[in-house]
Interface confidence: low
């Protein structure tokens, strides 16, 4: 199709080579067409999947995204050619930074319902550069935490290194929705609730004598509870003896609850005590079986191919540890009578 009639927007993504970060493009189709294409779906406030589910017809979404090759080749369908770019309804998510993301991206309605719709498209010219400002050591992170129940703030990474003399008006979005009341390079949250979690985008305009463009950064904001003051507790095993049948296989599960820690390095392992000897056992990897805002339950199993007389003399000890301390629970095997 002819893209000469598309409205054009220029964007700059300056990424930090020190950290992982994502980027998004919104399909800002002219109103009133937009609302007909991007049909909403209903979720509860906390069901925020990594990529929002597609709804409606068998079409993957209601808008089509293309990239325009720089050599003048025909437009390429994003979904077919770029696995690191995810289309989520009217938003394009770039999962990894890199100058190879530079280029022209075009979106338009998938269903052309009227002659007007043919010209209803947006062309976004994206320039991607690594951050070169060596003096900007303390730029805001692209992953920021807010402590539930306290005051907090979300800073725009691309502006956090600028002097106060340079304070452009910033446009903020939360999960793609314009936050119309926010204009500064920092959103101050008087009291943090769980709904403050999400993907925030900050935009501001830069100009030179020739043209102007939008500088954009994406911030993943997580709402967290304060770091736990407790060592982990073992939920299972509860009993210190376990009835077993000799010669039969046995799996003993150790489940432990770890309180939230911003820097989370949980330890859960099994070791065996036999007389004065003790040694760690090679067991399957630990797995998280439940994760909430406040804590995480991690399980690790010890597997005996068959229980022997020797195992009845041993103690099987589950050891769990976080930054606060450790807890152990030992199990003695007892032959079933």
């Amino acid at each position: 199709f002819n893209i000469s009639g598309c409205s054009t927007k220029k964007l700059l993504w300056t990424y930090s080579t020190r950290s992982e970060e994502e980027f998004v493009l919104f399909c800002d189709l002219p109103e009133p067409q937009k609302s007909h294409f991007c049909h909403r779906n209903r979720l509860s406030p906390k069901q925020v999947p990594e990529h929002l589910p597609f709804m409606g017809s068998n079409d993957l979404s209601d808008v089509q995204w293309y990239q325009q090759p720089s050599n003048g080749d025909p437009l390429e369908d994003i979904r077919k050619s770029y696995p690191h770019i995810i289309q989520d309804k009217c938003t394009l998510h770039f999962l990894t930074p890199g100058v190879n993301n530079s280029g022209s991206y075009i979106c338009r309605p998938k269903m052309i319902k009227s002659p007007y719709d043919v010209a209803c498209c947006v062309k976004m010219i994206l320039e991607v550069k690594p951050q070169t400002n060596a003096s900007c050591e303390y730029s805001a992170s692209h992953k920021q935490d807010l402590l539930l129940g306290s005051t907090g703030s979300i800073s725009c990474p691309s502006l956090s290194c600028q002097s106060d003399a340079q304070s452009p008006a910033v446009t903020w979005y939360k999960n793609g929705k314009l936050l119309s009341v926010e204009r500064s390079n920092r959103i101050v949250v008087d009291e943090v609730y769980d709904y403050h979690q999400g993907t925030y985008v900050c935009d501001y305009t830069q100009s030179d004598t020739v043209s102007s463009w939008t500088v954009r950064a994406v911030v993943q904001v997580r709402t967290i509870v304060g770091d736990t003051k407790l060592k982990p507790d073992i939920l299972d095993p509860v009993e210190d003896t376990l009835e077993v049948e000799l010669g039969k296989p046995l799996t003993i599960s150790c489940k432990a609850r770890f309180g939230f820690e911003r820097v989370f390095n949980p330890v859960i392992k099994w070791y065996i005590k036999d007389s004065d000897l003790e040694w760690e056992v090679s067991v399957p990897e630990a797995k998280s079986i439940k994760s909430t805002l406040k804590d995480e339950i991690i399980e690790r199993n010890i597997i005996l191919e068959k229980v022997t007389q020797r195992d009845l003399r041993r103690k099987f000890v589950c050891f769990v540890q976080n930054s606060i301390g450790n807890t152990t629970q030992s199990v003695q095997l007892k032959e079933k009578r």
Partner: antibody, heavy 123, light 107 residues
């Protein structure tokens, strides 16, 4: 199909505490925000406040000093208490579910409502 | 708090008429506006959210438009079941607030 049902005394004396409960049936109370709204006779709607399943609350500043909203997830219920009532608190009280509509954008909507319960404040 | 002012407060119309109700916000609220219909003795029913999007099951004769401070609810061809009171509500900032309502009566 989620349904909401308000319950509580229809008559409350001035200076006492109004207590209402909203029972959620046909769905879980988890993962949503739950709202109270009231409507005085012949007048418009007034948002009282909400609670999340985890107990986070947000109240209308005009009522904040007198309002408490609580949740009991085990009973699939949430409740409203309004203290020191006067005749001005006479109204139909509605409970409603607040949902987020997602497109990549977020929109808040109150999509499921109870049928309302009339509370009269009179001695 | 953000104030919402609806106009007119009431109107009389006939079946088949085109009816327009406006809602003005005291400050910009982007498109964070919903419209509800309320019939006597009943709870409000969501018609439109995000200023212009139909709630499922709502007839297409209802449409919403606007952004910022000025919003409109239009009923393209009034039906007998549309005689009711209509409220706008903002979801831009707490506390959520409603307009005072517009009563649509039979002429």
């Amino acid at each position: 199909q989620v349904q909401l049902q308000e319950s509580g005394p229809g008559l409350v004396k001035p200076s006492e505490t109004l207590s209402l409960t909203c029972t959620v049936s046909g769905g879980s109370i988890s993962n949503y925000y739950w709202t109270w709204i009231r409507q005085p006779p012949g007048k418009g709607l007034e948002w009282i406040g909400y609670i999340s399943d985890s107990g986070s609350t947000n109240y209308n500043p005009s009522l904040k000093s007198r309002v408490t909203i609580s949740v009991d997830t085990s009973k699939n219920q949430f409740s409203l208490k309004l203290s020191s009532v006067t005749a001005a608190d006479t109204a139909v009280y509605y409970c409603a579910r607040e949902t987020i509509v997602v497109r990549g954008f977020y929109f808040y909507v109150m999509d499921v409502w109870g049928q309302g319960t009339t509370v009269t404040v009179s001695s | 708090a953000i104030q919402l002012t609806q106009s007119p407060s009431s109107l009389s119309a006939s079946v088949g008429d085109r009816v327009t109700i406006t809602c003005r916000a005291s400050q910009g609220i982007s498109s964070a506006l919903a419209w509800y219909q309320q019939k006597p003795g009943k709870a409000p029913k969501l018609l439109i959210y995000d200023a212009s999007n139909w709630e499922s099951g709502v007839p297409s004769r209802f449409s919403g438009s606007g952004s910022g401070t000025d919003f409109t609810l239009t009923i393209s061809s009034l039906q007998p079941e549309d005689f009711a009171t209509y409220y706008c509500q903002q979801f831009n900032s707490y506390p959520w607030t409603f307009g005072q309502g517009t009563k649509v009566e039979i002429k």
